[in-house]
Interface confidence: medium
Amino acid sequence: MGLTSQLLPPLFFLLACAGNFVHGHKCDITLQEIIKTLNSLTEQKTLCTELTVTDIFAASKNTTEKETFCRAATVLRQFYSHHEKDTRCLGATAQQFHRHKQLIRFLKRLDRNLWGLAGLNSCPVKEANQSTLENFLERLKTIMREKYSKCSS
């Protein structure tokens, strides 16, 4: 009984890894983490999810996947760098303050994972088009889900 319970976690881990290997290396833990983070981010509004960001998806026809991820990360970094201490976003209640702190924490995690997926040092973001942060995140979620469905099928 004790031996079985000791063997189960490594066995489960090996099976999970084998599953990932069969599906292809692109369907890695980072992608799952990104989707999980995006799900959390799009679940609830905060005072600042309607602030605008550069819409990199409006004209992304000649852009590689890696460039898209890199530019998305750049946009998110610009957003949280500018609005992390924005008094409007921090709000006036403990709940608003907590939700904003959570938003920033998720954006930073998303930024870090997108950089990892992109594997690029830098990328220009010059678009004039604007989108709200929440619409930007919804669009990114759609892209990531499509990518996941391709690599896991």
């Epitope: 509004k45 905060t46 005072l47 600042c48 999810t49 309607e50 602030l51 605008t52 960001v53 550069t54 610009q78 957003f79 500018h82 709000g91 608003q96 604007q130 709200t132």
Partner: nanobody, 116 residues
Framework: EVQLLESGGGLVQPGGSLRLSCAAS????????MGWVRQAPGKGLEWVSW????????YYADSVKGRFTISRDNSKNTLYLQMNSLRAEDTAVYYC?????????WGQGTLVTVSS
């Protein structure tokens, strides 16, 4: 082109009330958070209040909490600021604001003077 036109400012005695309006055009008003910023004579810009598109979440600066009420009418593309119990320190030019990326876009402003 984004246009924000404020109105409703004027001279009022301490303790009095005013209602500011902001008519918005050139963008889908109902999709965006909007707010009010003010600039007192010789001072910097201060965020007064902010409201999300649905109107369910609002923010107020500590200096106006309990006295000012922000609201919006998405069917009329209009933002409001009801100001009660006005004080001399509320004297400022009030601007209606829409966020635009790392910059904020605001109108020409309306002057509110609180004096006896």
């Amino acid at each position: 082109e984004v246009q924000l036109l404020e109105s409703g400012g004027g001279l009022v005695q301490p303790g009095g009330s005013l209602r500011l309006s902001c008519a918005a055009s050139g963008f889908t008003f109902r999709n965006f958070g909007m707010g009010w910023v003010r600039q007192a004579p010789g001072k910097g810009l201060e965020w007064v209040s902010w409201i999300i598109s649905s109107g369910t979440e609002t923010y107020y600066a500590d200096s106006v909490k309990g006295r000012f009420t922000i609201s919006r009418d998405n069917s009329k593309n209009t933002l409001y600021l009801q100001m009660n119990s006005l004080r001399a320190e509320d004297t400022a030019v009030y601007y209606c604001a829409k966020s635009l990326g790392r910059f904020d876009y605001w109108g020409q402003g309306t002057l509110v003077t609180v004096s006896s």
